[in-house]
């Protein structure tokens, strides 16, 4: 912690501006007001500080409001940002864009996905839901940056939107995420014929039930790969060969190359042996031939 | 030895169709799948499509989907591409290739089909 | 369709130097599961049939020389031949097999300088 010191009258700061990167350390913690420095807050990113100097205006900061910084001076935070911790964050209350969006730029190329995750977080809650607007800013700022966000804030996306999210700003959403996505996508592309349905719906396709992967596989959608490897386990077990021909189409001919891999692995090993001969692939490990599979979770269940 | 043997140089007429060969040996038949990819003379190259030779269901790029036809022999391990309804930019060498797994692993010589009236 | 732009459309280089082709896909071609990215390299050398050099980005085929490396991830590829040799002229192309129509670049010729 900096020392307490008192400031020389001729060091006394009544305006932040650049002759402030010349005091030290303890000269910055003794000579500037914190109020002064909340006031003032637009000027600081312009101020080519120190790291160690950020250290001692954040320490001013942190003492000046307890409890969280008001957003008047989260919008001006600039370079400053990179100084916060997520608990720092967690107790702040944000609610507008232009801030978000000016401190998704100050993290641009730094390692915070702790602190963006943490912030957006507080300005779902801010906002009191994920609305459009918010979606629009986080794809255009943060690519994937949706899915940092939790299943519970995720609900909160109404249908409507859905419509802004693109493909890439699902590829980090685990199977949770989409599990709450996937229904309000569902929904939100109804109305729309086979092909563009499945076009849309494919991003969001990790959330599926098996009905619906079922049902995907009678509409020649020809499922790429990556897709089907997104897919819960739970929806691809009970799959049959001929359905998984039909759902992949020309991408079946993958699966040698990812058979090694969850689902696919567990895929095969449930499938009779002839069965999965009939894709051409030198698949192995299937049930052999006159072997009889007995489901003992049903027994179970029962008793 | 992996190996792919294409049938002869072909001319056609505007209008008429080609059956291209390729025959396989040098592995088990049915365990990999072919593909068709053509090259117009000084171009890229162009996938139209490939084949399970098991069970003989093909999938083709839907820029040929009305003209082209895959189909398999598996008595003599041949695959066969037809193209109907030809047309001077069909003129091009005409390729079958073994898949490794997606991408193509093993090429024949190409048949080269040329479209003149 | 996933359109794959390479770059640049020939080079020349002397015997011996790197040579570095860049391929550049319209959308990712990494499978996020299995961490394998679906681009495999062909060098087509001149009146003849096209051959494997690489998969899944980075895998060099058995039997393809080491100066040939892969590398790159999610829409952005480079293909790098280490020191030059005679032998080496020919078209290269990059084609992901990630969906259908699987798609190739438009090639890029290497040339002695």
């Known amino acids: 912690d900096v020392e307490r010191t008192t400031c020389p009258p001729e060091k006394e700061v009544h305006e932040i501006d650049e002759s402030l990167i010349f005091y030290k350390k303890r000269e910055l913690e003794a000579c500037v007001d914190a109020a002064l420095l909340a006031a003032q807050m637009d000027r600081v990113d312009a101020i080519p500080f120190t790291y160690e100097q950020l250290d001692v205006l954040k320490h001013k900061l942190d003492e000046l409001y307890p409890q969280g910084y008001p957003e008047s001076v989260i919008r001006h935070l600039g370079h400053l940002f990179l100084k916060m911790s997520p608990e720092d964050i967690r107790k702040w209350n944000v609610t507008s864009l232009e801030t978000l969006k000016a401190l998704l730029k100050v993290s641009k190329g730094h390692e915070m996905s702790a602190q963006v995750a943490t912030l957006i977080d507080r300005v779902v809650v801010g906002r009191g839901q994920l609305d459009k607007d918010t979606v629009d800013t986080l794809t255009a700022f943060c690519p994937g940056c949706l899915c940092s966000l939790s299943p519970e804030r995720l609900s909160s996306v109404p249908p409507s939107v859905i419509g802004a999210v693109r493909p890439q700003d699902l590829d980090t959403c685990g199977p949770r995420q989409l599990d709450v996505l996937y229904p309000k996508a569902r929904l939100a592309f109804q109305n729309m014929s086979g092909s563009e349905y499945f076009v849309k719906i494919r991003p969001f396709l990790g959330g599926a039930p098996t009905e619906d992967v079922k049902a995907l596989s009678q509409q020649n959608v020809s499922m790429d790969l990556a897709t089907f490897m997104k897919l819960r386990r739970e929806a691809v077990l009970p799959l049959t060969v001929a359905e998984v021909q039909k759902l992949l189409g020309p991408h079946v001919e993958g699966l040698k190359v990812e058979e090694q891999h969850s689902p696919v692995r567990d895929w095969i090993l449930k499938q009779r042996q002839d069965d999965l001969d009939t894709l051409g692939l030198g698949l192995q490990g299937g049930i052999p031939n006159g072997y009889l599979i007995l489901d003992l979770s049903v027994r179970e269940a029962l008793s | 030895e992996v190996q792919l043997v294409q049938s002869g140089a072909e001319v056609k007429k505007p209008g008429a169709s080609v059956k291209v060969s390729c025959k396989a040996s040098g592995y088990t038949f049915t365990n990999y799948w072919m593909h068709w990819v053509r090259q117009a003379p000084g171009q890229g190259l162009e996938w139209m499509g490939n084949i399970n030779p098991s069970s003989g269901d093909s999938y083709y790029n839907e820029r040929f989907m009305s003209r082209v036809t895959m189909t398999v022999d598996k008595s003599t391990s041949t695959v066969y591409m037809e193209l109907s309804s030809l047309r001077s930019e069909d003129t091009a060498v005409y390729y079958c290739?073994?898949?490794?797994?997606?991408?193509?692993?093993?090429w024949g010589q190409g048949t080269l089909v040329t479209v003149s009236s | 369709d996933i359109v794959m732009t390479q770059s640049p459309d020939s080079l020349a280089v002397s015997l011996g130097e790197r040579a570095t082709i860049n391929c550049k896909s319209s959308q990712t071609l990494l499978n996020s599961v299995s961490q394998n990215n679906y681009l495999a390299w062909y060098q087509q050398k001149p009146g003849q049939s096209p051959t494997l050099l690489i998969y899944f980005a980075s895998t060099r085929e058995s039997g393809v020389p080491d100066r040939f490396s892969g590398s790159g991830s999610g829409t952005d590829f480079t293909l790098t031949i280490s020191s030059l040799q005679a032998e080496d002229v020919a078209v290269y192309y990059c084609?992901?097999?990630?969906?259908?129509?699987?798609?190739f670049g438009g090639g890029t010729k290497v040339e002695i300088k």
């Open positions: 084609q992901q097999h990630y969906r259908t129509p699987y798609t």
């Open positions: 290739a073994r898949s490794g797994g997606l991408w193509l692993a093993f």
